[in-house]
């Protein structure tokens, strides 16, 4: 019995279906086929879970969180024991193993391994200003999304004709911050943060209004 090499890893957007491949060759008839799909979740590597099982002509469900979402892609028994997972969740990310037994065919590689990564587009980021908006001050524009896999990068731009940040601004696209030093009236305006990753983008807006000093009355 020999389980074929798998593609290594599969990426899928959250909510979309995933197909985890597992095919094998065997010298024996498929009358005593046993298949177990297991997952070692990324979120809990110490707790492997059963996904779906086939034994003695019957299908058995695995962990309750997979109920109604998982099945074999074809009619069993077969040498293609790939499974589908519908409505993929973030918690489905992990390392999946198909373990195949088909007595009396023993020996060879009876395990196939496929990684599944469920990708999540950035959630609507939260924009905020840190620091005084008085002229001459330094301010930091902050942007962060609660969700996003892979981790989003953040691009700040000023919504004017140039889309360029002020010359005194420095940007950290990983942290999602822009530091603008010595703000002036020219620093005022709408700023947009674009959070993006491999499968999506999301934005937020921030209105920076630099406060000019009030003229003082001399009595």
């Amino acid at each position: 019995l020999e389980v074929s090499e798998s593609p290594g890893s599969i990426q899928v957007a959250r909510g979309q279906p995933a197909v985890l491949p597992c095919t094998f060759t065997t010298s024996a008839a498929l009358i005593n086929l046993n298949v177990i799909w297991m997952v070692t979740p990324l979120s809990n590597a110490n707790q492997p879970e059963q996904v779906i099982l086939y034994q003695g002509g019957q299908m058995f469900d695995g962990a309750p969180r997979f109920h109604g979402r998982v099945g074999f892609t074809g009619t069993m028994p077969a040498t293609n024991v790939s499974i589908f997972i519908n409505n993929t969740q973030l918690s489905d990310t992990g390392t999946y193993q198909c373990l195949v037994n088909n007595l009396p065919d023993i020996g060879g590689r009876n395990i196939g391994v496929t990684g599944l990564t469920v990708l999540v587009p950035p959630s609507a980021p939260h924009c905020q200003i840190q620091g005084s908006q008085d002229i001459g001050s330094d301010v930091i524009l902050l942007c962060s999304s609660e969700e996003g896999i892979p981790r989003p990068t953040y691009l700040w731009e000023k919504l004017d004709n140039t889309l360029k940040l002020p010359p005194t601004a420095t940007q950290d696209q990983v942290q999602g911050t822009v530091t603008i030093r010595n703000i002036s009236a020219l620093s005022s305006g709408l700023y947009q943060c674009v959070a993006s990753n491999a499968i999506g983008t999301s934005t937020c807006l921030l209105d920076l209004q630099v406060i000019s000093p009030q003229p003082r009355n001399i009595g």
Epitope: N32, Q55, Q58, D61
Partner: antibody, heavy 124, light 107 residues
Framework: EVQLVESGGGLVKPGGSLRLSCAAS????????MNWVRQAPGKGLEWVSS????????YYADSVKGRFTISRDNAKNSLYLQMNSLRAEDTAVYYC?????????????????WGQGTMVTVSS | AIRLTQSPSSLSASVGDRVTISCRAS??????LNWYQQKPGKAPKLLIY???RLQTGVPSRFSGSGSETDYTLTISSLQPEDFATYYC?????????FGHGTKVEIK
């Protein structure tokens, strides 16, 4: 304590219907496949039907196919067997039985927990 | 469906005797064989699974062996509480089937 308690048995005329229930306690019902197994008076055991934990997969013995329907309600920890078009040969004690999958020979399935049974008599 | 033939259908034995019960399958079932004990008016109880593995809590005087089509349940030293009917059952394929039983009676 792990327990299965059947109810709903009784006397019914040929062609009649009956619904058996099984109340489970002491284990996570929603994680296990469940079965009905019957035993005619003075006879051996006969597997009747199986249902997987999520109700995705259902199996019947040829002798009851098209007449019996197995179902479950995981929220109520309950297993059911709706029996229609009953015949005299359906007379038996009906057991509610849990299946477990054990890691042996790859995997194998076993009837590990049995209820006390409920008697169904089909007679005119 | 796979047929399981148990022999003998009944036997008489004394406390302390060694008892063996045979179960023959109509085709190779690759050790997917389980044994159950049933006392009068009671539900069956799992003794042995996968041909030779002892279920938790079952006394070690019970053992199972066999391969392919031929399987055996052995009680090394019969105790008073062992007088009962014993069934073999295969989980190799659907439908799951049982043998007709072997009744162990007091001599």
């Amino acid at each position: 304590e792990v327990q299965l308690v059947e109810s709903g048995g009784g006397l019914v005329k040929p062609g009649g219907s009956l619904r058996l229930s099984c109340a489970a306690s002491g284990f996570t019902f929603s994680s296990y496949s469940m079965n009905w197994v019957r035993q005619a008076p003075g006879k051996g055991l006969e597997w009747v039907s199986s249902i997987s934990s999520s109700s995705s997969y259902i199996y019947y013995a040829d002798s009851v196919k098209g007449r019996f329907t197995i179902s479950r309600d995981n929220a109520k920890n309950s297993l059911y067997l709706q029996m229609n078009s009953l015949r005299a040969e359906d007379t038996a004690v009906y057991y509610c039985v849990r299946s477990i999958i054990v890691q042996a020979l790859g995997i194998t399935s076993v009837f590990d927990i049995w209820g006390q049974g409920t008697m169904v008599t089909v007679s005119s | 469906a796979i047929r399981l033939t148990q022999s003998p259908s009944s036997l008489s034995a004394s406390v302390g005797d060694r008892v063996t019960i045979s179960c023959r399958a109509s085709q190779i079932i690759s050790n997917h064989l389980n044994w159950y004990q049933q006392k009068p008016g009671k539900a069956p109880k799992l003794l042995i699974y996968a041909a030779s593995r002892l279920q938790t809590g079952v006394p070690s005087r019970f053992s199972g062996s066999g391969s392919e089509t031929d399987y055996t349940l052995t009680i090394s030293s019969l105790q008073p509480e062992d007088f009962a009917t014993y069934y073999c059952q295969q989980s190799y394929s659907n439908p799951r089937t049982f043998g007709h039983g072997t009744k162990v009676e007091i001599k």
